[in-house]
C-alpha cells in the first residue's frame, strides 16, 4: 500500500489508477477506515449521507473534502479500462495536525545550585498524533534521568477534536559552580515525521549559589562549662557567615525569652542555671542553624572540675554532646 | 513567504567592526530563531549563534564568544550581528537563517577585511 | 562538539546515473527522547545559499524533487540521488541540530 499523510481539515484526492478519464467508468472504491464498521464501497453514482465525507470524482478519483480522525485507514480502488484490464490501486492513510508553537509556562526566574528544581512546564496544544516534548539545555538535548534531569510527562485528548494536549514538567539540580545563566528551551517533534520541529522561546534563568554552611560554633568560658555557685559562665556563638545572622539561645531543648545576642552571660550560677545550652543562627537567605549543644554545670566545693579542652567531647566529665 | 534580506558586501580594515544586518518578512518575527553561519571562500558552513527576537536571548558557538554579538530590533524586524577586531580570517560569507534545520536562508553577505 | 565527515569529497557522475554519498558523526545524533535523527542534508549550488533538502534524517522538505532521499540513523547516514539532473550540481551539506550545531565538510558533485 502506498503511504498518504494528510492534513486534518485539507482536502485529499485519491487517484484510481488505469480508470478511464471519463464515465462510464467500471470501477469501486472500498474503505476501511474510522468512520466503516468494516469495508464501505462507494461507486461513482454516489449519492446519501458519505457525499459530504468522501465522493467519487468524474475522473474515477476519490475526494475527501476535509479529512478528519476517523478518515484513516485503507482505500482501495480497482478499475477496468476500456479494454477489460483490471487495476488496482492501494493506500494507507494517515492524518496530522500541527499544534500551535510551545510555549513554556510557569518558568522560574531563578534556580538553586545543587538541589533540585522545576524550571517550567512545556505546554503544546493540538497535535495529532501526539508527538513529544522535549528539553534542550545550551543548544544540547537533555535526557531524562541522566545528571539530576527529571521530566514529568503528561498527554491529554480533547474530547470532541481527537487533538492531543501534551505537558512536560522540567526538573533539574545545577551543578555547583556551573553556568549562571543556563539556556533552556522545549522543542515539539511531530508523531508523523512530515514537519519540522517547533521551538519554544527560551527561558534564561540565574542559579543561585548558596553558601556552603559554616558551623556554628559554641564557645564557653571557663572552659568545660564548670563554676562553682556564684560564678559567671559566658556562652559565645560565633558564626562566620556574613551578614550576621541574627542568634538566639535554647536551653534544654527550649528558646530562652531573651533578644537576639550573639553572647549568653549567666552570673551569679545557681542550680537553676545547670542545663544543656545552645545557640540558633538564622539566616535570612536560608534556614535556622544550630550550634553543638555544651552542659553547664555546678561543682561543689572539694569536686574537681573536667578535664580541660572537653567541649563537645563525648563521656568526659560533666561536659558532653547533647 | 518568509524572506531574509541581508545587507550588502562589506570591504573593511583589519582591527576594526562590522555590523551586517537581516530583514525578515512573511511571518513573525519575534516567535523565531534567528541563527547566523559562517563560510569562508571555497570552505564549508561554520554555526556562529542565534538569537530569539522576542526575548533577545542570545547563544554563542564558543569559538565566535567576544568575536560576535547577535542583536535584533523588533520594529523593524531586523537581526544583526557585529563582528569585531577584525582579521583575515574574517573574511568570508555570512548568513542569516530562520529554525533548525534551517529552511530560510538569506542572500548572504560578502565581508572582506583587507588593509 | 559532535563532528561530521562527509564523502567523498568530490565526484563526478553522468546525467541519469544514481548518485550517494556518505555523512558520518563523531556521536549518535538519535535522541532517546522521540527516536529522531536530527539530522539535515543541504544542497548548496555555486553563489547561492544553501537549500534545505531533507530534515529527520529522512524527511523531504517540501518542493524538493522525490529523487533526492536520506536514510541513516544513529552515525551513519546517506543522500542518494536516484537520477541525477544537471541542475544538481553543487555542494551537499549534512547537519546535525541535536547538540548544538555542526556541518560536515560537504561533497561536491560535478555533471560529467
Known amino acids: 500500500a502506498q503511504n498518504i499523510t494528510a492534513r486534518i481539515g485539507e482536502p485529499l484526492v485519491l487517484k484510481c489508477k488505469g480508470a478511464p478519464k471519463k464515465p462510464p467508468q467500471r470501477l469501486e472504491w472500498k474503505l476501511n477506515t474510522g468512520r466503516t464498521e468494516a469495508w464501505k464501497v462507494l461507486s461513482p453514482q454516489g449519492g446519501g449521507p458519505w457525499d459530504s465525507v468522501a465522493r467519487v470524482l468524474p475522473n474515477g478519483s476519490l475526494f475527501l473534502p476535509a479529512v478528519g480522525i476517523q478518515d484513516e485507514g485503507i482505500f482501495r480502488c480497482q478499475a477496468m479500462n476500456r479494454n477489460g484490464k483490471e487495476t488496482k490501486s492501494n493506500y494507507r492513510v494517515r492524518v496530522y495536525q500541527i499544534p500551535g508553537k510551545p510555549e513554556i509556562v510557569d518558568s522560574a526566574s531563578e534556580l538553586t545550585a545543587g538541589v533540585p528544581n522545576k524550571v517550567g512546564t512545556c505546554v503544546s496544544e493540538g497535535s495529532y498524533p501526539a508527538g513529544t516534548l522535549s528539553w534542550h539545555l545550551d543548544g544540547k538535548p537533555l535526557v531524562p534521568n541522566e545528571k539530576g534531569v527529571s521530566v514529568k510527562e503528561q498527554t491529554r485528548r480533547h474530547p470532541e477534536t481527537g487533538l492531543f494536549t501534551l505537558q512536560s514538567e522540567l526538573m533539574v539540580t545545577p551543578a555547583r559552580g556551573g553556568d549562571p545563566r543556563p539556556t533552556f528551551s522545549c522543542s515539539f517533534s511531530p508523531g508523523l515525521p512530515r514537519h519540522r520541529a517547533l521551538r519554544t522561546a527560551p527561558i534564561q534563568p540565574r542559579v543561585w549559589e548558596p553558601v556552603p554552611l559554616e558551623e556554628v560554633q559554641l564557645v564557653v568560658e571557663p572552659e568545660g562549662g564548670a563554676v562553682a555557685p556564684g560564678g559567671t559562665v559566658t556562652l559565645t556563638c560565633e558564626v562566620p557567615a556574613q551578614p550576621s545572622p541574627q542568634i538566639h539561645w535554647m536551653k534544654d531543648g527550649v528558646p530562652l525569652p531573651l533578644p537576639p545576642s550573639p553572647v549568653l552571660i549567666l552570673p551569679e550560677i545557681g542550680p537553676q542555671d545547670q542545663g544543656t545550652y545552645s545557640c540558633v543562627a538564622t539566616h535570612s537567605s536560608h534556614g535556622p542553624q544550630e550550634s553543638r549543644a555544651v552542659s553547664i554545670s555546678i561543682i561543689e566545693p572539694g569536686e574537681e572540675g573536667p578535664t580541660a579542652g572537653s567541649v563537645g567531647g563525648s563521656g568526659l566529665g560533666t561536659l558532653a554532646l547533647a | 513567504q518568509v524572506q531574509l534580506q541581508q545587507s550588502g558586501p562589506e570591504l573593511v580594515k583589519p582591527g576594526t567592526s562590522v555590523r551586517i544586518s537581516c530583514k525578515a518578512s512573511?511571518?513573525?518575527?519575534?516567535?523565531?530563531?534567528i541563527h547566523w553561519v559562517k563560510q569562508r571562500p571555497g570552505q564549508g558552513l561554520e554555526w556562529i549563534g542565534w538569537?530569539?527576537?522576542?526575548?533577545?536571548?542570545?547563544n554563542y558557538h564558543e569559538k565566535f564568544k567576544g568575536k560576535a554579538s547577535l542583536t535584533a530590533d523588533k520594529s523593524s524586524s531586523t537581526a544583526y550581528m557585529q563582528l569585531s577586531s577584525l582579521t583575515s580570517e574574517d573574511s568570508a560569507v555570512y548568513f542569516c537563517?530562520?529554525?533548525?534545520?534551517?529552511?530560510?536562508w538569506g542572500q548572504g553577505t560578502l565581508v572582506t577585511v583587507s588593509a | 562538539n559532535i563532528m561530521m565527515t562527509q564523502s567523498p569529497s568530490s565526484l563526478a557522475v553522468s546525467a541519469g546515473e544514481k548518485v550517494t554519498m556518505s555523512c558520518k558523526s563523531s556521536?549518535?545524533?538519535?535522541?532517546?527522547?522521540?527516536?529522531?535523527?536530527?539530522l539535515a542534508w543541504y544542497q548548496q549550488k555555486p553563489g547561492q545559499s544553501p537549500k534545505l533538502l531533507i530534515y529527520?534524517?529522512?524527511t523531504r522538505e517540501s518542493g524538493v524533487p522525490d529523487r533526492f532521499t536520506g536514510s541513516g540513523s544513529g552515525t551513519d547516514f546517506t543522500l542518494t540521488i536516484s537520477s541525477v539532473q544537471a541542475e544538481d550540481l553543487a555542494v551537499y551539506y549534512c547537519?546535525?541540530?541535536?547538540?548544538?550545531?555542526?556541518f560536515g565538510g560537504g561533497t561536491k558533485l560535478e555533471i560529467k
Open positions: 537563517a530562520r529554525e533548525d534545520p534551517f529552511a530560510y
Open positions: 512573511g511571518y513573525t518575527f519575534t516567535s523565531y530563531y
Open positions: 538569537i530569539y527576537p522576542g526575548n533577545v536571548i542570545t
Open positions: 556521536q549518535s545524533v538519535l535522541y532517546s527522547s522521540n527516536q529522531k535523527n536530527y
Open positions: 529527520w534524517a529522512s
Open positions: 547537519h546535525q541540530y541535536l547538540s548544538s550545531y555542526t
